[in-house]
């Protein structure tokens, strides 16, 4: 009897180990979204970037949803959010309308239940991109740890979107779940 | 009999708890590598930085390997990768060959099976470091969430390596595993 | 008898699952602290920032302590630490004492047992904020993975604190535990 129980226990514990491993390590939501430059707005004002890749190159998503330019949370939890935004200008692109630029990123959270948008993180710099240099470049990185509820949406706003670097290694944002909410 | 089973179960569950805790929390790979400035290349072009500390000061590594200037993945998984690169110049170091600088970092992944190198993340800025100021400084930070396979290698490329700040709190890169691959 | 044992086992395993989930996913320490701008030091020198929110807006803390301007570690482990610091100046604030600025952040660790302070991460830039532009902005982001022991304290030092952006999305720092120490 005791032997039978041990064997049964080993079997159940084995499946429990699999279950625990799967539930803990594999079900954790994440996303890494890279810029889709085929549809970048013009203008120098602050705009929401709605075109992102989620399934090509470095871009990937799991247990989160990408819809209408927003990253949607499917699972309550504490997440680490990050964004890397690169701006660049080459003289061959033409003359800048102004050499004094505000190059900014805003990572925002929208709650559908209470239709409101709040900025979680911002970063950037004012730059003087003079005509003396043929090429200009600048990158922003922001990151932080936030409580997100199912249904909340993360989006990215930038100034001067026409200066965005369209490479997947340059302009991206993402999130990964770190822990549950108590 | 029932009491004996309960006691045995508690004992087995106890060891299971230890095992689960150990396997989950302690076996997760990570690395934090700090610049070894004794062997920095001299040019201003983009170069791969091959000298990093892995076992002194803040530098550490576990369940990953550092070899030939590359951080080698030993365990499949999704990892958060990051890099912080600081550049600095003091007039006592001499006159800059040009005051217009591209200060850049590229975090690259190399697959040995398919010998190819791809940039995962890039960041930086063009800077005008004029002789009017005796000291100049600039830092770049990049970070992102990537799927890495065992045997893949992470390396760091920078422009103007002779301008790197050699402090361990200034120029470093790292990775930590967040979750398994489904 | 065997049926009773199975039922008991399921019940115990169920509670074990709850316990494991709670201990693993919920007890992990974290903090996200946002600047409290009511008490920012003046001057352009390097100062320690002691006023942070821990319980309003995006600010939160769990299984860590905030005291005397320092984030105190309560649980040994490997943590990801990060900081985002924004500086800004508008001409309506008055003329800058100097147009050549060092805008810097230092993330430091203090051990009470051995009263010593060490910089874990630094970042920033020298900037020329000329009077030709009415508004200037610059953000710094740093992040890294560090071994922290119970009782150790994390604090933030910046230069030019009077230029700090007081928004909660602009100037903040934080930490979250990733794994235990072996």
């Amino acid at each position: 009897g005791s032997q039978h129980i041990r064997a049964e226990k080993a079997m159940v514990d084995g499946s429990w180990l699999d279950l625990a491993k799967r539930s803990k390590l594999e079900a954790q939501p994440f996303a890494h979204l890279t810029i889709n430059a085929t549809d970048i707005p013009s203008g120098s004002h602050k705009v929401s970037l709605s075109s992102w890749y989620h399934d090509r190159g470095w871009a990937k998503i799991s247990n989160m949803t990408f819809s209408n330019g927003k990253l949607i949370v499917n699972q309550d939890g504490f997440y680490y959010l990050y964004a890397n935004i690169c701006f660049r200008h080459h003289e061959t692109s033409g003359d800048l309308a102004t050499e004094y630029l505000q190059l900014m990123v805003y990572v925002t959270k929208t709650s559908i239940k209470i239709p409101s948008s709040h900025t979680l993180m911002k970063g950037g710099s004012t730059k003087y991109w003079s005509g003396n240099s043929e090429f200009h470049f600048y990158s922003i990185n922001v990151g932080g740890f936030f409580k997100l509820r199912s249904g909340e949406e993360i989006s990215i706003e930038v100034s001067n979107p026409s200066l965005l670097d369209p490479d997947q290694d340059a302009t991206y944002f993402g999130a990964f779940k770190v822990r549950d909410i108590d | 009999g029932s009491q004996h089973i309960r006691a045995e179960k508690a004992m087995v569950d106890g060891s299971w708890l230890d095992l689960a805790k150990r396997s989950k929390l302690e076996a997760q790979p990570f690395a934090h590598l700090t610049i070894n400035a004794t062997d920095i290349p001299s040019g201003s072009h983009k170069v791969s930085l091959s000298s990093w500390y892995h076992d002194r000061g803040w530098a550490k590594i576990s369940n990953m390997t550092f070899s030939n200037g590359k951080l080698i993945v030993n365990q499949d998984g999704f990892y958060y990768l990051y890099a912080n690169i600081c550049f600095r110049h003091h007039e006592t170091s001499g006159d800059l060959a040009t005051e217009y600088l591209q200060l850049m970092v590229y975090v690259t992944k190399t697959s040995i099976k398919i010998p190819s190198s791809h940039t995962l993340m890039k960041g930086g800025s063009t800077k005008y470091w004029s002789g009017n100021s005796e000291f100049h400084f600039y830092s770049i930070n990049v970070g992102g969430f990537f799927k890495l396979r065992s045997g893949e290698e992470i390396s760091i490329e920078v422009s103007n390596p002779s301008l790197l700040d050699p402090d361990q709190d200034a120029t470093y890169f790292g990775a930590f595993k967040v979750r398994d691959i489904d | 008898g065997s049926q009773h044992i199975r039922a008991e086992k399921a019940m115990v395993d169920g509670s074990w699952l709850d316990l494991a989930k709670r201990s693993k996913l919920e007890a992990q320490p974290f903090a996200h602290l946002t600047i409290n701008a009511t008490d920012i030091p003046s001057g352009s020198h390097k100062v320690s920032l002691s006023s942070w929110y821990h319980d309003r807006g995006w600010a939160k803390i769990s299984n860590m302590t905030f005291s005397n301007g320092k984030l105190i570690v309560n649980q040994d482990g490997f943590y990801y630490l990060y900081a985002n610091i924004c500086f800004r100046h508008h001409e309506t604030s008055g003329d800058l004492a100097t147009e050549y600025l060092q805008l810097m952040v230092y993330v430091t660790k203090t051990s009470i047992k051995i009263p010593s302070s060490h910089t874990l991460m630094k970042g920033g830039s020298t900037k020329y904020w000329s009077g030709n532009s009415e508004f200037h902005f610059y953000s710094i982001n740093v992040g890294g993975f560090f071994k922290l022991r119970s009782g150790e304290e994390i604090s933030i030092e910046v230069s030019n604190p009077s230029l700090l952006d007081p928004d909660q999305d602009a100037t903040y720092f934080g930490a979250f535990k990733v794994r235990d120490i072996d």
Epitope: - | G43, T92, G94, D95, N160 | -
Partner: antibody
Framework: QVQLVESGGGVVQPGRSLRLSCAAS????????MHWVRQAPDKGLEWVAV????????YYVDSVKGRFTISRDNSQNTLYLQMNSLRAEDTAVYYC????????WGYGMDVWGQGTTVTVS | DIQMTQSPSTLSASVGDRVTITCRAS??????LAWYQQKPGKAPKLLIY???SLESGVPSRFSGSGSGTEFTLTISSLQPDDFASYYC?????????FGQGTKVEIK
């Protein structure tokens, strides 16, 4: 291996022009400043001109200012010296040389070509 | 422009001798001084940069010292391959100048 090969020297009459070339190989040409240095027969070395790695900065010895122009084509890994209004005192072996540091001036010249002879008579 | 004065112009020595060559700048150049060796019909070869740093691959018997206006090149034990001409070269404020050279010949 790291190599610099000069060409374009020859005999030329005073007042005429000549263009020297220096082909670089074995190192990342785009990462380093480049010099021209000359040596008159049985004389010492004289620095002539330098160009930064990106071509934005150029400096000359006073005696050639306004007559000589240093340039580079980073896509072709080639350095040039355009010499106009040549004089008898420009007669020398002309060497191209690589800057030891790409970022800073002042660290010396660590790689030299074999030289090309220019005779003005 | 800064003038560089090398001394002596010619130096006669034997194998195994310790040899010192001096270079003086007309005003301070901090440590921005290099030393070169040149053999007849050949291009110069960098020995020392930034006054005292030994170029990679150069024998350790060569050493440099000095800062400001006075600099020295020392060959601790002269070898047969060391008989050649030696030049100092300064850098200051976007200008480069060489000394007139020192010829080391066999005594």
């Amino acid at each position: 291996q790291v190599q610099l090969v000069e060409s374009g020297g020859g005999v030329v009459q005073p007042g005429r022009s000549l263009r020297l070339s220096c082909a670089a190989s074995g190192f990342t040409f785009t990462g380093y400043g480049m010099h021209w240095v000359r040596q008159a027969p049985d004389k010492g070395l004289e620095w002539v001109a330098v160009i930064s790695y990106d071509g934005t900065n150029k400096y000359y010895v006073d005696s050639v200012k306004g007559r000589f122009t240093i340039s580079r084509d980073n896509s072709q890994n080639t350095l040039y010296l355009q010499m106009n209004s040549l004089r008898a005192e420009d007669t020398a072996v002309y060497y191209c040389a690589k800057c030891l540091s790409g970022t800073y001036w002042g660290y010396g010249m660590d790689v030299w070509g074999q030289g090309t002879t220019v005779t003005v008579s | 422009d800064i003038q560089m004065t090398q001394s002596p112009s010619t130096l006669s020595a034997s194998v195994g001798d310790r040899v010192t060559i001096t270079c003086r700048a007309s005003r301070s150049i901090n440590s921005w001084l290099a030393w070169y060796q040149q053999k007849p019909g050949k291009a110069p070869k960098l020995l020392i940069y930034k006054a005292s740093s030994l170029e990679s691959g150069v024998p350790s018997r060569f050493s440099g010292s000095g800062s400001g206006t006075e600099f020295t090149l020392t060959i601790s034990s002269l070898q047969p391959d060391d008989f050649a001409s030696y030049y100092c070269q300064q850098y200051n404020n976007y200008s480069w100048t060489f000394g007139q050279g020192t010829k080391v010949e066999i005594k």
